[in-house]
């Protein structure tokens, strides 16, 4: 059930889940100068019953200059600097994304934890597509990806995003509107992300996180 | 079955100009973006541009100065490609060409045949 | 605008035989880079994406690599339908930008 591949990459783009399904593993990743605590887990993991999902386990990790001790070393002003830019990049999250059944939310950030984040998705596992920063989107279609079993075999569905820099010789006619109502594309299958202009999601995403964090990968 | 059907061959002037329409069925015309690509006859391809089905946006190459226009019509999930001043080095095989699947330009027309000649 | 340098021009080889054909660009492309190869009086066909994934139904003698500014596309033993002209497209950076082609004869 975990997903074998890897979401598509778009060029100038990058990708988030909203929710975690249950079965998804979360790594123990620490930055640069720590480690695990010897006896912590490997992985967080998304469990839950029918009316409550959460992460069982709890990263931890300490100075790898630490030995026999879980006691957490102060960061200096510079990771200090770096963890608040964490706390700033908790995603957005919409309501009926996170609190939806058999999903958990984004996990709070741990202590000293990687700059990147290293997930194992499972099969029905969607995640959304925006435009990095400097970028808006020239092309639209349904901007996320959803992880399917398909003759035995996952794969990730392709997101119709086409991301062009802001500079670039472009026609944009007007604001993220189509031509005619796409019919073939309900509400209920759109992602949260394009009922609002481009930059109108740039800003707000912008405000609350970096390309870093919501570059995702996983193996 | 994904399919893009193109208009038929033209022979133009110089200075004239030609619409080429794609016509798309197999999947929701609004959800992929829509490219012109140009062959010359012996030569190599050029990408001349794309269009979001979506919402009109577009990107042209500067190669072609200005000279085309790719607009698309929601109503009949058409695509068209407008070139003009057209001049003897503009006659080419232009294809359109959408991506569908996992990667860029997997489905195509077959190809429509401009001659420009006085 | 990423120019995209194909080589060699043209090759000639024997069915069985391995090739590789190469592809450099201008600056860094991030591996958004597909392979295609197109027969006369065809549309071209889609082989590889993102420098080295195989797209469906592709035979398996078909492969891409690379990263950053130089590529490959090798056919591990070449058959006789293979024979064409292949392109290689970056497709990071608008405009889109081909190879000039590389055409595959048989000797």
């Known amino acids: 059930e975990l997903c074998d591949d890897d979401p598509p990459e778009i060029p100038h783009a990058t990708f988030k889940a909203m929710a975690y399904k249950e079965g998804t593993m979360l790594n123990c990743e620490c930055k640069r100068g720590f480690r695990r605590i010897k006896s912590g887990s490997l992985y967080m993991l998304c469990t839950g019953n029918s009316s409550h999902s959460s992460w069982d386990n709890q990263c931890q990790c300490t100075s790898s200059a630490t030995r026999n001790t879980t006691k957490q070393v102060t960061p200096q002003p510079e990771e200090q600097k770096e963890r608040k830019t964490t706390e700033m990049q908790s995603p957005m999250q919409p309501v009926d994304q996170a609190s939806l059944p058999g999903h958990c939310r984004e996990p709070p950030p741990w202590e000293n934890e990687a700059t990147e984040r290293i997930y194992h998705f499972v099969v029905g596992q969607m995640v959304y597509y925006q435009c990095v920063q400097g970028y808006r989107a020239l092309h639209r279609g349904p901007a996320e990806s959803v992880c399917k079993m398909t003759h035995g075999k996952t794969r990730w569905t392709q997101p119709q995003l086409i991301c062009t820099g802001e500079m670039e010789t472009s026609q944009f006619p007007g604001e993220e509107k189509p031509q005619a109502s796409p019919e073939g594309r309900p509400e209920s299958e759109t992602s949260c992300l394009v009922t609002t202009t481009d930059f109108q999601i740039q800003t707000e995403m912008a405000a609350t996180m970096e390309t870093s964090i919501f570059t995702t990968e996983y193996q | 079955e994904v399919q893009l059907v193109q208009s038929g061959a033209e022979v133009k002037k110089p200075g004239a100009t030609v619409k080429i329409s794609c016509k798309v069925s197999?999947?929701?015309?609004?959800?992929?973006?829509m490219h012109w690509v140009q062959q010359a006859p012996g030569k190599g391809l050029e990408w001349m541009g794309v269009i979001s089905t979506y919402n009109g946006n577009t990107n042209y190459n500067q190669k072609f100065k200005g000279r085309v226009t790719i607009t698309a019509d929601t109503s009949t999930d058409t695509a068209y490609m407008e070139l003009s001043s057209l001049r003897s080095e503009d006659t080419a095989v232009y294809y359109c060409?959408?991506?569908?699947?996992?990667?860029?330009?997997?489905?195509w027309g077959q190809g429509t045949l401009v001659t420009v000649s006085s | 605008d990423i120019q995209m340098t194909q080589s060699p021009s043209s090759l000639s080889a024997s069915v069985g035989d391995r090739v590789t054909i190469t592809c450099k660009a201008s600056q860094d492309i991030n591996s958004y880079l597909s392979w295609f190869q197109q027969k006369p009086g065809k549309a071209p066909k889609s082989l590889i994406y993102r420098a080295n994934r195989l797209v469906d139904g592709v035979p398996s003698r078909f492969s891409g690599s690379g990263s950053g500014t130089d590529f490959t596309l090798t056919i591990s033993s070449l058959q006789p339908e293979d024979f064409a002209t292949y392109y290689c497209?970056?497709?990071?950076?608008?405009?889109?930008?081909f190879g000039q082609g590389t055409k595959l004869e048989i000797k």
């Open positions: 060409a959408t991506s569908y699947g996992n990667y860029p330009f997997d489905y």
């Open positions: 197999g999947y929701t015309f609004t959800d992929y973006a």
């Open positions: 497209l970056q497709y990071d950076e608008f405009p889109y930008t």
